[in-house]
């Protein structure tokens, strides 16, 4: 069972004073880290106990493995049921705690009730302050039964639950018909899922017969021993004041676990702590009593004392339970009360006793669950103590459970009872993840989904490249970390599995599956340095660059042109995309920027030294276009144009460019400077005879501006052949400029 | 679906007796508190007589004390009145009903005439 | 002589609201939130419409409300419609040793 306890302070004099505190024995509790499972939970449940809302409720953790809830503030903010939630995955318990308050009408004799499938549980509720009117009885909060005030028995309300069954189990209510549900009597009933003594799926097994009040789990068999008790079977009492699956912890303050109510997993629910009784576990035993809730007797024989917390402290020469065995009578000796091992393996385990007359090796057995008997093949012995060896056939999951250490003599005979667990070495049901790779290295996380049992102990990694026939790499490495595999080959494929391992012999799982996990091309090393640039318009950068030469062929797929743009904070990246390309046209820039530019050669996703950066300023953008362009034929070798100026100049125009091209004609259209820049009128001369032409223009101040629109005139008929357009300029008149 | 089905009643004479019935379904009768309630013609409600999970436990209206008789039987889910020494005034639809959790008449059964006639 | 005093009758038009009251004594409905009432259409058995003082169990329409002062409780219906005419009758615990629960004498609902 999961080692949590729900310990509830009962000194209920200040209700501010109140506190639950969970706390968990298990390794790594309550961190809530992925690597040890989800925290601590400590809530108050209002599904079946609804209280008035009063301000929320303190939670305070201490440390990874407790967690207190605090802040109560009237004695109505106690009553109900209260629940800690601890362990991860499948062992996830939660521990319940019911709470009662001391001034209800009715009061439960016993809180929790604990029984078998089958038996008859009773339900018994104290009149403590009487009202003369029906009794609800509520299961789960809905509606279960009634009694008259005339039935109540000895000032006592008894429900009778006959051939109680698992779904029965729950949380139970006394209420006098229109009392306050604050005045009720709140119950906790457990219905363990099998017979008396049984435990199983099928309930075939026995359980171990818990000892000191211990309460046999119906699916584990174990034993959930009271506060104050360990071992398998409960039979050993831990010192005053401590509690825990191993006595690991210790009550709070100087009273020790006085007005402390424990609760612990099903089916054993809440009691006081060992050596206290009374409803706020407050008063001591009486003489000749002890353990948790004083329940048990000591009955001490051959002079032994009782001991509240303990039981009966035997007299030298005398041991057991009531003092009742001889030290003369055989005992077995410090057996462990659970041993761990792997499936498969085969395992030696011993067996020491000791006794007058003295064992001999013929005289130990070894009882496995299934009733087969092993003998031991070999004894040591000692002057105090006999230790038979047993060889223990490979083991099967079904040998789990408990086996028993028998020795008989002539004095009498002794056996001791253990716990076997039987482990499946995880196997992994995943492969491993590849988190980053580079030519040479992968970097892997190796822990994944597994089947069988933890904890795992070491991760191996097992790898070498696909298709290969060659022995496998291994590494082994932490559970908790990733692994970098290195001194891979580049681009080449390798088949990667995981093997993990649990603790002890035979721990070694199988391989988990295989994964394909690539490694990267190999770097580009070399560095281009930029032969030059320049610039082809206001947004137009033309770059050069070149390698070194290196023999060999070019490990590279292309090149990555890198702009910067250092006054807005903005990069431009270009990919060109040939590892032969030395040159590269850089469009739709911003005019008038200056940017930093370089270059590297790029492999797969991989990327080689950048060139050193060079400084680019580009021109900034250029005037308006030129407005009213107008084209009238003046001969059949002559046409003349108009324009008016660009609007909102940014300053004085140097030029205008003019272009000229046949209309429908298929060649480079042809370039004219008018280099008078106040002139708004152009002859273009040498045109030919009956020919259309379309013409558009534009500015330059310290850049080419935006073109104008498009004009399209034919030039008059019947002229020769002209050897190309030229142009004459003057300023319009005032009769033109329409 | 819970379901009272009386039956039992009839005509009778002044100090006669008649046994009614009631059988109960749809829900555990062993839990509940259950009440025999009359209706005279043309009147209203008047409680009867109640009895208790167990059976231990019964009440009865002053005006039918010491005549009538409640009791039930777990094992069958059936619930009985006894009426003996009836008079002219026992004349009523008789009908059973579960108290439910709220404490009310949760389920009525579809009643059954008593007349008590000469 | 019922213990619980009801009006013999009420009447109101379709969609009004009407109350219908039951005044006991600090034996019964004083005593406990235990108020109930049922409605009871000719030759049908009872149906349960209110307990615990306003409580209304599951499928009552809730036009029908309930509501306590003092040692008297009230029946209220509001969007009166043609089916609500019946009789309505409202119970309640009692501490007097002879009476387990007490009946009104039942009022007669008519819708105009």
């Known amino acids: 069972a999961v080692d949590l306890t729900l310990l509830a302070n009962l000194r209920l004099t200040d209700p501010q004073r109140f506190f639950l505190t969970c706390v968990s024995g298990e390794a790594g509790a309550g961190r809530g880290s992925d690597a040890w499972g989800p925290p601590l939970l400590l809530e108050k449940d209002d599904r079946i106990v609804r209280t008035p809302p009063g301000p929320p409720l303190r939670l305070a953790r201490n440390g990874s493995h407790q967690v207190t809830l605090r802040g109560f503030s009237k004695p109505s903010d106690l009553v109900g049921v209260f629940s800690c939630v601890g362990g991860a995955g499948a062992r996830r318990t939660r521990v319940i705690y019911v709470h009662n308050s001391p001034g209800a009408h009715l009061l439960p004799d016993k809180v929790t009730h604990t029984v078998n499938k089958g038996d008859t549980a009773v339900l018994s509720a104290r009149v403590h302050k009487e009202k003369q009117t029906d009794v609800i009885w509520k299961s789960n909060g809905s509606y279960f039964y009634t009694l008259d005030w005339h039935e109540a028995q000895d000032g006592r309300f008894l429900l009778q639950l006959p051939n109680v069954q698992p779904p029965s189990s729950g949380i139970y209510s006394a209420t006098y018909l229109e009392a306050s549900p604050l005045g009720s009597a709140f119950f906790r009933l457990i219905v363990r899922g099998c017979g008396a003594g049984r435990w199983g799926p099928g309930c075939t097994k026995e359980c171990p017969g818990c000892l000191h009040g211990g309460v046999c789990h119906d699916h584990d068999g174990e034993c959930v021993c009271p506060p104050g008790f360990t071992g398998t079977r409960c039979e050993q009492a831990c010192r005053e004041g401590r509690f825990g699956q191993s006595c690991q912890e210790q009550c709070p303050g100087i009273s020790g676990c006085r007005g402390l109510t424990f609760c612990l997993p099903d089916p054993y629910g809440c009691s006081c702590g060992s050596g206290w009784r009374g409803s706020q576990c407050q008063e001591a035993c009486a003489p000749g009593h002890f353990g948790a809730d004083c329940r048990l007797q000591c009955q001490c024989q051959n002079g032994g004392t009782c001991d509240r917390f303990s039981g009966c402290v035997c007299p030298s020469g005398w041991h057991g339970v009531h003092c009742e065995k001889s030290d003369r009578i055989p005992q077995i000796l410090n057996m462990a009360s659970e041993l761990e091992f792997n499936l498969e393996t085969m395992p030696r385990i011993n067996c020491a006793a000791a006794g007058n007359p003295f064992p001999v090796r013929g005289s130990i057995e070894l009882r496995k669950p299934d009733g087969t008997v092993l003998l031991s093949t070999k004894a040591i012995v000692e002057p105090e103590k006999t230790t038979a060896e047993f060889e223990v056939p490979r083991l099967v999951l079904a040998d789990s459970g408990f086996w028993e250490c028998r020795v008989s003599t002539s004095g009498g005979q002794d056996s001791r009872r253990f716990k076997v667990n039987v482990k499946v070495p995880p196997v992994p049901l995943a492969a491993p993840r590849l988190l980053t790779k580079q030519s040479r290295q992968l970097v892997v996380s190796p822990l994944v989904s597994f089947s069988g049992d933890g904890p795992i102990s070491t991760v191996r990694l097992h790898y070498r490249p696909q298709d290969s026939t060659m022995d496998w790499s291994t590494i082994v490495v932490d559970p908790s970390e990733n692994v970098t595999l290195m001194n891979l080959r580049p681009k080449t494929g390798y088949s990667v599995r995981v093997q993990l391992s649990r603790p002890g012999e035979g721990g070694e799982g199988a391989w988990g599956p295989p994964t394909l996990m690539t490694t990267d091309c190999p770097e580009p090393l070399l560095q281009p340095w930029l032969e030059g640039w320049h610039v082809e318009g206001t947004d137009r950068l033309r770059v050069s660059w070149s390698l070194p030469l290196v023999p060999g062929p070019l490990v590279g797929d292309g090149f990555l042109l890198r702009l910067w743009d250092g006054t807005r904070g903005q990069e431009r990246r270009e990919n060109v995309s040939s590892p032969q390309a030395r040159t590269a046209l850089l469009t739709g820039l911003t005019p008038g920027t200056h940017y930093q530019l370089d270059v590297q050669l790029y492999h797969c996703t991989l990327l080689g030294p950048a060139s050193p950066p060079a400084h680019v300023l580009l021109p900034p953008s250029g005037p308006p276009a030129p407005r009213h362009l107008h084209a009238q034929a003046l001969s059949d070798s002559e046409i003349q144009l108009t324009w008016k100026h660009p609007e909102a100049l940014p300053g004085p125009i140097s030029k205008y460019v003019v272009e000229v091209q046949v209309a429908g004609g298929a060649g480079d259209p042809l370039w004219i400077d008018v280099d008078r820049p106040e002139e708004t009128s152009t002859i273009i001369r040498g045109l030919n005879a009956s020919t259309r032409y379309l013409f558009r223009m534009r500015a330059s101040i310290q850049g080419l501006g935006d073109w104008s629109n498009t004009v399209e005139e034919s030039t008059l008929g019947n002229g020769l052949q002209a050897e190309g357009p030229v142009q004459e300029s003057r300023a319009a008149e005032e009769g033109l400029d329409q | 679906e819970v379901q009272l089905l009386e039956s039992g009643g009839g005509l009778v004479q002044p100090g006669g007796s008649l046994r009614l019935s009631c059988a109960a379904s749809g829900f555990t009768f062993s839990r509940y508190v259950m009440y025999w309630v009359r209706q005279a013609p043309g009147k209203g409600l008047e409680w009867v007589s109640v009895?208790?999970?167990?059976?231990?436990?019964?009440y009865y209206a002053d005006s039918v004390k010491g005549r009538f008789t409640i009791s039930r039987d777990n094992s069958k889910n059936t619930l009985y009145l006894q009426m003996n020494s009836l008079r002219a005034e026992d004349t009523a639809v008789y009908y059973c009903a579960r108290r439910g959790s709220s404490g009310a008449f949760d389920y009525w059964g579809q009643g059954t005439l008593v007349t008590v006639s000469s | 002589q019922s213990v619980l005093t009801q009006p013999a009758s009420v009447s109101g038009s379709p969609g009004q609201s009407i109350t219908i009251s039951c005044t006991g004594t600090s034996s019964d409905i004083g005593r406990y939130n235990y108020a109930s009432w049922y409605q009871q259409r000719p030759g049908k058995s009872p149906k349960l419409l209110i307990y615990e003082v306003s409580d209304r169990p599951s499928g009552v329409s809730n036009r029908f409300s309930g509501s306590k002062s003092g040692n008297t409780a009230s029946l209220i219906i509001s969007g009166l419609q043609a089916e609500d005419e019946a009789d309505y009758y409202c119970s309640s615990y009692s501490s007097t040793n002879s009476l387990q629960v007490v009946f009104g004498g039942g009022t007669k609902l008519s819708v105009l």
């Open positions: 009895i208790y999970p167990s059976g231990g436990a019964t």
